[in-house]
């Protein structure tokens, strides 16, 4: 999906008002020095591409993020503010239902959510190179 035509300001507002708080809740008890951000993004469409990948695609050691509250709210925000996004996700959602696993918060998941917080941070404040 190409995130170029999303309403970035509406997504940002949704992130600040709810999604960010759910991410903080998920990370509660984790030290702020624990994880270094290794995933980066250069502009808002790129940040949303990375956010979608990290939120909804299962990875080794962390298969369960898509069912977390922050993930469901992220999906809703993208569906509302990115034209045509929900249609592209129907097949992905059906595939996800087939491989549903029980929720387990692993250290790998905590690291992944820390990366997500970093991506959202750059989505909110892209530091464009000065000409």
């Amino acid at each position: 999906y190409d995130f170029t035509n999303c309403d970035f300001e509406k997504i940002k507002a949704a992130y600040l008002s709810t999604i960010s708080k759910d991410l903080i809740t998920y990370m509660s008890g984790t030290k702020s020095t624990e994880f270094n951000n290794t995933v980066s993004c250069s502009n808002r469409p790129h940040c949303l591409t990375e956010i979608q990948s990290l939120t909804f695609n299962p990875t080794a050691g962390c298969a369960s993020l898509a069912k977390e509250m922050f993930a469901m709210k992220t999906k809703a925000a993208l569906a509302i503010w990115c034209p045509g996004y929900s249609e592209t996700q129907i097949n992905a959602t059906q595939a996800m239902k087939k491989r549903r696993k029980r929720k387990v918060t692993t250290n790998k998941c905590l690291e992944q959510v820390s990366q997500l917080q970093g991506l959202w941070r750059r989505f909110n404040r892209p530091l464009l190179k000065q000409q």
């Epitope: 300001e9 507002a13 600040l16 960010s20 020095t33 970093g118 941070r121 909110n124 404040r125 530091l127």
Partner: antibody
Framework: QVQLQQSGAEVKKPGASVKVSCKAS????????IEWVRQAPGQGLEWMGV????????YYSQKFQGRVTMTADKSTSTAYMELSSLRSEDSAVYFC????????????WGQGTTLTVSS | DIQMTQSPSSLSASVGDRVTITCRAS??????LVWYQQKPGKAPQLLIY???NLQSGVPSRFSGSGSGTQFTLTISSLQPEDFATYYC?????????FGTGTKLEIK
């Protein structure tokens, strides 16, 4: 807990340069932008620029372009702001500030470094 | 660059009063506005981000509203520790700029 510890007060002559340090602790230094803000005596806050400590990318206010250099030393978790060709109007308190978890504000500030430029 | 204008520049009020400070942006900044409180000799402290979100640990008597170009900070019932200078700042795009400040004094 998060702390930004700045270097001490400086007195400089017009035309000289000053380098202010901001040592960060209590968080992952390279994950957050560091901004520099100054405040002249009895005046408001003035944004100077920002650095990404991970990449070294900077963005300076046009007002300070050519006179300011912001750097970061990842090994010591310290950000630096150097201002050259000083003039009396540069006398101010200089603050470093860390961007918040959400990237939508500054949540922690240094205590400020007072610079006096006088002949 | 986006210009931020605050009004009033100074304000006298009493403990218990309801106070409103306004911030105007020279162009649409959506909800990308922050409010800070600063006391003499100290660094600013974050109150509100994203125009209406209360920073953790900030008393609920502080609230923010507005979007686009017009924003307000409201203190519902002034406490003695609230007498300070308040600044808005846009967080829309680099370069960021601050408002002109509003000094809140005891009547």
């Amino acid at each position: 807990q998060v702390q930004l510890q700045q270097s001490g007060a400086e007195v400089k002559k017009p035309g000289a340069s000053v380098k202010v340090s901001c040592k960060a602790s209590g968080y992952a230094f390279t994950n957050y932008l560091i901004e520099w803000v100054r405040q002249a005596p009895g005046q408001g806050l003035e944004w100077m620029g920002v650095i990404n400590p991970e990449s070294g990318d900077t963005y300076y206010s046009q007002k300070f372009q050519g006179r300011v250099t912001m750097t970061a030393d990842k090994s010591t978790s310290t950000a630096y702001m150097e201002l050259s060709s000083l003039r009396s109007e540069d006398s101010a308190v200089y603050f470093c500030a860390k961007e918040s978890l959400t990237g939508s504000s500054y949540d922690y500030w240094g205590q400020g470094t007072t610079l006096t430029v006088s002949s | 660059d986006i210009q931020m204008t605050q009004s009033p520049s100074s304000l006298s009020a009493s403990v218990g009063d309801r106070v409103t400070i306004t911030c105007r942006a020279s162009e649409n900044i959506y909800s990308n506005l922050v409010w800070y409180q600063q006391k003499p000799g100290k660094a600013p402290q974050l109150l509100i981000y994203g125009a209406r979100n209360l920073q953790s640990g900030v008393p609920s008597r502080f609230s923010g509203s507005g979007s686009g170009t017009q924003f307000t900070l409201t203190i519902s019932s002034l406490q003695p520790e609230d007498f300070a200078t308040y600044y808005c700042q846009h967080f829309y795009e680099t370069p960021l700029t601050f408002g002109t400040g509003t000094k809140l004094e005891i009547k």
